[in-house]
Interface confidence: low
């Protein structure tokens, strides 16, 4: 399948529009601080070059790898050293080290201004004036803020973004039409980015085997009627797609994802009965739909797992002959029978099974040794079930905002060294598990909750990795991918933490809080709550609740006052004094 010119091959496969969009995403994900215009110029140069290679694959430099071509182009940026510092040193390296170097400098939390949404009329004018630039700008702004965003999926978001403006900018009430659609895309985009970030972390930090295990479990739940060989083929192809995207090989990734969607749709009879609707859609929608498709019904009368994996006398023989294939079959068979389990739980069970076989197949009587292996699964299954039950009860009692606050206190006490913005962001997201998952019947709670928590805790891990401050976070993040959530759950209050010095400035508020949205106001209050816990880690729930209630009353009072700023200054001093007294500071 070798091509004389890789760049020509991808240009022809993807078409000019997708080629340009993907190159822009790739460049923006690497050079996150570069101005839009600089990226557009680079993309246009690459596109013109690709066209010369399409015309003549033997033309000069057309035989170079995409990493070489793109890396050379990125290294022409004049301000590389002053903007990016040591990242400029990457340009002294040869491929593939140069690309690895660029990847290592991707920043999960770039110092970029928050995206402020202009007035609807302003956006519609910009859209009509230059639709192409408007959409490119969307790709650029998302890609630079989310350097691991799944590129082919970002094309799907851009298509929906365009459709929203096309429809709404000619509606009678543009804002009523457009704003909910943009909110929807923003929320879905954040969720999509976080899910993909976990896939990349899984591949990059724990390796291909870890990712493949995850994929076997998830695809077996989703396609329980598919045979093991079919699931294995899909896993291999899916791993290639995500390895490419996570590695910055976005053209190859998008091309291979399209091929995978084509294969799935051509073979849906042997994969899943739920794919029909997805497969009637255009490419981007089709791929998205397949990725989100609901689980197929389990085949009737599946035999007991024990026969092949416990009772059979050939267990050790089969395991010894091909360990990963046998474990893969175990995972496949267990997962297809258990759509009610989270993927991470299924992986814990497979790990327990593997550990047992490693020990028992070397024992005098292997069968006697592993006969009770399924009994070891019971506590592993019950732990997340009990945790979800307890937390859903708490969520139903408190509601989302107060549930988030409970988690803020819990996690600040566990890892108080973590920065306040990170604790607020992560705890708010952890708290959303309540409204996302607790309303579901028992059979659907665990896959919803625990797999969502894996995504959120990965956000904590990647943010913490940039500036490590807590050995406990590092330990939970690096020891085991599938045990991250149990590791964080098991953390108690950090007794070694020295409380932060009290700083009145942290608790000084101004009238601008009154004009904030409800969400932003919540974040302000939650930021104050984290700071309180950092000052007084031993504060009781009742003490913290009293201070937070006072704080809410203070904000409400001053926002109703005629002279808001004076109220915030005077009442704020009283609040700080009262809070210090309440907490014994």
């Amino acid at each position: 399948d070798a091509h004389k010119s890789e760049v020509a091959h991808r240009f022809k496969d993807l078409g000019e529009e997708n080629f340009k969009a993907l190159v822009l995403i790739a460049f923006a994900q690497y050079l996150q601080q570069c101005p839009f215009e600089d990226h557009v110029k680079l993309v246009n140069e690459v596109t013109e070059f690709a066209k010369t290679c399409v015309a003549d694959e033997s033309a000069e430099n057309c035989d170079k790898s995409l990493h070489t071509l793109f890396g050379d182009k990125l290294c022409t940026v004049a301000t590389l050293r002053e903007t990016y510092g040591e990242m400029a040193d990457c340009c002294a390296k040869q491929e593939p080290e140069r690309n690895e170097c660029f990847l290592q400098h991707k920043d999960d939390n770039p110092n970029l201004p928050r995206l402020v949404r202009p007035e609807v009329d302003v956006m519609c004018t910009a859209f009509h004036d230059n639709e192409e630039t408007f959409l490119k700008k969307y790709l650029y702004e998302i890609a630079r803020r989310h350097p691991y965003f799944y590129a082919p999926e970002l094309l799907f978001f851009a298509k929906r973004y365009k459709a929203a403006f096309t429809e709404c900018c000619q509606a009678a009430d543009k804002a009523a039409c457009l704003l909910p659609k943009l909110d929807e895309l923003r929320d879905e985009g954040k969720a999509s980015s976080a899910k993909q970030r976990l896939k990349c972390a899984s591949l990059q930090k724990f390796g291909e085997r870890a990712f493949k295990a995850w994929a076997v479990a998830r695809l077996s739940q989703r396609f329980p009627k598919a045979e093991f060989a079919e699931v294995s083929k899909l896993v291999t192809d899916l791993t290639k797609v995500h390895t490419e995207c996570c590695h910055g090989d976005l053209l190859e990734c998008a091309d291979d994802r399209a091929d995978l969607a084509k294969y799935i749709c051509e073979n849906q009879d042997s994969i899943s009965s739920k794919l029909k609707e997805c497969c009637e859609k255009p490419l981007l929608e089709k791929s998205h739909c397949i990725a989100e498709v609901e689980n197929d019904e389990m085949p009737a009368d599946l035999p007991s797992l024990a026969a092949d994996f416990v009772e059979s006398k050939d267990v050790c023989k089969n395991y010894a002959e091909a360990k990963d294939v046998f474990l893969g079959m175990f995972l496949y068979e267990y997962a297809r029978r258990h759509p009610d389990y989270s993927v991470v739980l299924l992986l814990r069970l497979a790990k327990t099974y593997e550990t047992t076989l490693e020990k028992c197949c070397a024992a005098a009587d292997p069968h006697e040794c592993y006969a009770k292996v399924f009994d070891e699964f019971k506590p592993l299954v019950e732990e997340p079930q009990n945790l979800i039950k307890q937390n859903c009860e708490l969520f139903e009692q408190l509601g989302e905002y107060k549930f988030q606050n409970a988690l803020l206190v819990r996690y600040t006490k566990k890892v108080p060294q973590v920065s306040t913005p990170t604790l607020v962001e992560v705890s708010r997201n952890l708290g959303k598990v309540g409204s996302k998952c607790c309303k579901h019947p028992e059979a659907k709670r665990m896959p919803c909750a625990e797999d969502y928590l894996s995504v959120v805790l990965n956000q904590l891990c990647v943010l913490h990795e940039k500036t490590p401050v807590s050995d406990r976070v590092t330990k939970c993040c690096t020891e085991s991918l599938v045990n991250r959530r149990p590791c964080f759950s098991a953390l108690e209050v950090d007794e070694t933490y020295v409380p932060k010095e009290f700083n009145a400035e942290t608790f000084t508020f101004h009238a601008d809080i009154c004009t904030l949205s409800e969400k932003e106001r919540q974040i302000k209050k939650q930021t104050a709550l984290v700071e309180l816990v950092k000052h007084k880690p031993k504060a009781t729930k009742e003490q913290l609740k009293a201070v937070m209630d006072d704080f809410a009353a203070f904000v409400e009072k001053c926002c109703k006052a005629d002279d808001k700023e004076t109220c915030f200054a005077e009442e704020g001093k009283k609040l700080v004094a009262a809070s210090q007294a309440a907490l014994g500071l």
Partner: nanobody
Framework: DVQLVESGGGVVQAGGSLRLSCAAS????????MGWFRQAPGKERERVVS????????YYADSVKGRFTISRDNAENTVYLQMNSLKPEDTALYYC????????????????WGQGTLVKVSS
């Protein structure tokens, strides 16, 4: 407290029409995708239709395409299900549900549920 209250169910002859409504309170309605599910006696609950937060995206199960129409009024915090050419197999308890994100199929993507309204189609 979040409440989803369905209304409009009843008994109708095959070939007839019904319009179900679902009034939402206690949530920011325009921030939620909405869906209608149904559960016939002795059967699993199945998604019938759903509509995205802005109303720009809709989903219909094969069994109702061309007969049912979902719409929403964000100003009134209400989602509607217009059911035409009803068949006896449409008989079920119809539930309204709300999802934080555009929900692509899994029941567990829906965060809030109504109590249901009964639709009985006689032949």
């Amino acid at each position: 407290d979040v409440q989803l209250v369905e209304s409009g169910g009843g008994v109708v002859q095959a070939g007839g029409s019904l319009r179900l409504s679902c009034a939402a309170s206690g949530l920011t309605f325009s921030s939620y995708a909405m869906g209608w599910f149904r559960q016939a006696p002795g059967k699993e609950r199945e998604r019938v239709v759903s509509i995205s937060r802005g109303g720009g995206y809709t989903y219909y199960a094969d069994s109702v395409k061309g007969r049912f129409t979902i719409s929403r009024d964000n100003a009134e915090n209400t989602v509607y299900l217009q059911m035409n050419s009803l068949k006896p197999e449409d008989t079920a308890l119809y539930y309204c549900a709300a999802a934080r994100y555009w929900a692509t199929g899994s029941e567990y993507e829906f965060d809030y549920w109504g109590q249901g309204t009964l639709v009985k189609v006689s032949s």
